[in-house]
Interface confidence: low
């Protein structure tokens, strides 16, 4: 019998776990007959016999193959089912006849590991740490045999490096014979880690080759001292009254520093603390010109108790002052000329703008709004816009109005009204004047006035219609201190022979018509806004 | 050129209220880029911070004397007020009226201000 | 409070000799800090502020230097019309304080 050593390497037969091993008896005819074989389990050098091949058939030995064992291919096969990887060791085979000779099989067993979990450290790592510290925990479970490890930083992986970087893997083994893998890497990281990437690798065999599963990319918290503070406003370029605008304080550490915003006291030059929401911002909604100035953002180290100062600020919310029209009421005669001044204070060049009110007709691009000639049209509103062109929407206004002395005037001298007898009519006359006139019915009825604006009245009248009442008709008269005038209302009874109203008459309300306005020439002159005092 | 002055009674009783106002000329109260200060001077001693009024009312006063002083303003005539109640002895000293910004350009001319029964 | 300190309390020079006061602050007042000259009978004037800007009208042989706790006033040739009494004052914290002064007296 040749000696152990030379005794010829064993075939490999390599399974996946659960699956069924082949083990072909390789002894050729003149080593053994095969109808007559014993199978050997070998484990740490000590032979169990498994099962009997005679006369071709198969009978398994009592023990842990029992139930798993069978015959393939005509007996030179033995079939081992359900493969554990507590089968992984050498078979044998060993012919009686003619001499004892044996053929060896090495079993080996594979399993993939389940996917790889990892798991960062949630308490995060500072940078000034004097050694390692631990960055994720890596866990392969149930794989055969075990699993290589390799960690990988922004896709290149990391090796062990002395007081850098770490790696301490740990198995245990499972009641399946299985291995868990547990990989812990411990760096030394720097401020750039923050945004570092890494995960780990599994590489592990299985019969069809090399095979490695990834786990899912993690970044680990990195703590690290702030440097700097800064203020940031939102939203960013030119800021108006009105506008909801956000100051927050950032930091470039980790963890953020607690930090406190502040507006310099323009008169004290202390700085003076915001009060912020929960989440540390200043928010100025509505936006007003106080609120401009020199703001600057305090981050305090609660666990250094190391203050930093951001650089400060200048905060400027732009306004429109309120406008102020001069004069306030003007009253003037007909014939005569009227300047209008408006003026603005605003944090901006302002643009002026004279309107006509009734008719939103532009009259004038500058402060002063000059009127010859005045006659009773001109009479009304005027109103003058501030607006700051270079900021959309920031522009304040002012309405006068301009008041012409004069009689009475009345909407219409004469009017037709298509009446039945008995019915309660509703009539309306309106004048206009300055002083604002009054206005008296001829009739008796039910009267009010309405103010429409400080030189116009309208009046209303109910009057029930009589025989008397067609007769006579209806006058209107308005009067003030400068004189009266008078409308007429003829009433016409409608029958069945009458037309239908032409456009001349009405059968309710008489409205006023739209009157021309005129101004004759103006000119505008130039106005600088006063400067600021100086500190003193 | 701005000009301050001080007026009230040079004479005060123990436990009664000191009253001075401070009249601004040549410049308004109002412009917010000074506060208004009042500070003394005891008999051949050193100068003493009183506190401030801010054309919008804030006031600051120093904590050795907060419990007893009052400062108000007045924009519409100008001018802002000095309160200082239970007087005594100590409190003779003559009184200034200062507009303040990088320290006290104008000050009033002062006013002495005596406590005795 | 902030305790400003001056020395010397008393300083003998003779007229065109340079004189130096200082003031010292029990805490940083950065440079918010301000020279008063006070004659009897008057108001004090105001000679610098922002520890080293001459107020307006202030001759130029008044200046200031430092920043922080320690301040210097120096006035480079004495004139007759410069003995008086100097005070500092900080206005960088609430309560303002002034030093107690010095005292320039003709030697």
């Known amino acids: 019998v040749p000696g152990e050593a030379e005794q010829p390497a064993p075939e490999l037969v390599e399974v996946e776990v659960g699956s069924t091993a082949l083990l072909k008896c390789g002894l050729s005819q003149s080593q053994g007959n095969l109808s007559h074989v014993d199978w050997f389990s070998v484990h740490k050098e000590k032979r169990t016999l498994i099962f009997r091949v005679r006369q071709g058939q198969g009978q398994s030995e009592p023990g842990e193959y029992e139930q798993r064992l069978s015959l393939q291919d005509r007996g030179a096969t033995l079939a081992l089912t359900q493969v554990t990887p507590q089968d992984e060791r050498i078979f044998l085979c060993q012919g009686k006849r003619p001499r004892s000779q044996e053929y060896r099989i090495q079993l080996r067993v594979y399993k993939a590991p389940e996917e790889p979990n990892i798991q960062v450290n949630p308490l995060g790592i500072p940078v000034n740490s004097k050694e390692p510290e631990e960055v994720a925990t890596c866990v392969g479970r149930n794989g055969y045999p075990i699993p290589q490890v390799i960690w990988y930083k922004n896709g290149r992986p990391l090796k062990e490096e002395k007081n850098r970087v770490h790696i301490q893997s740990s198995q245990t083994v499972e009641s399946s014979g299985l291995y868990t893998l547990q990989s812990i890497l411990k760096a030394q990281l720097v401020k750039e880690d923050k945004d570092a990437q890494f995960y780990c690798e599994l590489n592990y065999r299985l019969p069809s080759g090399n095979h490695m599963k990834e786990s899912r990319e993690v970044t680990v918290p990195v703590f690290y001292p702030t440097e700097k503070v800064w203020l940031e406003v939102e939203p960013v370029g030119m800021l108006k009254e009105g506008d909801r605008v956000e100051i927050r304080c950032l930091a470039d550490g980790n963890p953020p520093p607690h930090f406190s915003i502040s507006k310099q006291n323009p008169s004290t030059r202390e700085a003076e603390e915001e009060t912020t929401n929960d989440n540390g911002v200043l928010v100025l909604e509505p936006a007003r010109k106080e609120h401009s100035g020199r703001y600057e953002c305090q981050g305090l180290d609660l666990d250094t108790m190391i203050s930093l100062l951001s650089e400060p600020q200048e905060l400027l919310v732009n306004y429109v002052s309120d406008v102020r029209v001069s004069p306030a009421a003007p009253e003037r005669q007909e014939g005569s000329s009227l300047t209008l001044t408006c003026e603005a204070e605003s944090s901006q060049d302002l643009e002026f703008q004279w309107l006509r009110e009734e008719t939103g007709q532009v009259l004038e691009r500058g402060p002063v709004l000059q009127l010859h000639d005045l006659k009773r049209e001109a009479g009304g509103g005027y109103r003058c816009v501030a607006s700051v062109p270079s900021i959309p929407g920031l522009n304040r206004t002012q309405l006068v109005n301009v008041a012409i002395f004069g009689p009475p005037w009345m909407a219409f001298k004469e009017r037709k009204v298509w009446v039945k007898e008995n019915m309660v009519l509703n009539l309306s006359c309106e004048a206009s004047g300055h002083p604002r006139p009054t206005i008296s019915w001829n009739v008796n009825g039910t009267a009010s006035e309405q103010d429409q604006d400080p030189q116009r009245v309208l009046s209303t009248l109910n009057v029930l219609v009589t025989p008397e009442l067609l007769e006579t008709g209806v006058e209107c008269t308005a009067s003030n201190d400068l004189g009266k005038n008078t409308s007429i209302l003829f009433l016409e009874l409608v029958n069945l022979t009458t037309l239908t109203p032409d456009s001349n008459t009405t059968t309710g309300l008489s409205t006023s018509t739209a009157s021309p306005h005129t101004r004759a020439n103006s000119t505008s002159t130039e106005r600088k806004l006063p400067e600021p005092e100086s500190r003193g | 050129q701005v000009q301050l002055q001080e007026s009230g009674p040079g004479l005060v009783k123990p436990s009664q209220t000191l009253s001075l106002t401070c009249t601004v000329s040549?410049?308004?109260?109002?412009?917010?880029?000074?506060?208004w200060s009042w500070i003394r001077q005891h008999p051949g001693k050193g100068l003493e911070w009183i506190g401030y009024i801010y054309y919008s009312g804030s006031t600051y006063y120093n904590p050795s004397l907060k419990s007893r002083v009052t400062i108000s303003v007045d924009t519409s005539k100008n001018q802002f007020s000095l309160k200082l109640s239970s007087v005594t002895a100590a409190d003779t000293a003559v009184y200034y009226c200062a507009r303040g910004g990088d320290g006290y350009k104008y000050w009033g001319q002062g006013t002495l201000v005596t406590v005795s029964s | 409070e902030i305790v400003m300190t001056q020395s010397p309390a008393t300083l003998s020079v003779s007229p065109g000799e340079r004189a130096t006061l200082s003031c010292r602050a029990s805490?940083?007042?950065?440079?918010?800090l301000a020279w008063y000259q006070q004659k009897p009978g008057q108001a004090p004037r105001l000679l610098i502020y922002g520890a080293s800007t001459r107020a307006t009208g202030i001759p130029a042989r008044f200046s200031g230097s430092g920043s922080g706790t320690e301040f210097t006033l120096t006035i480079s040739s004495l004139q007759s019309e410069d003995f008086a009494v100097y005070y500092c004052q900080q206005y960088n914290n609430w309560p303002r304080t002034f030093g107690q002064g010095t005292k320039v007296e003709i030697k």
């Open positions: 040549g410049g308004s109260i109002s412009s917010g880029t000074y506060h």
């Open positions: 805490q940083s007042v950065s440079n918010n």
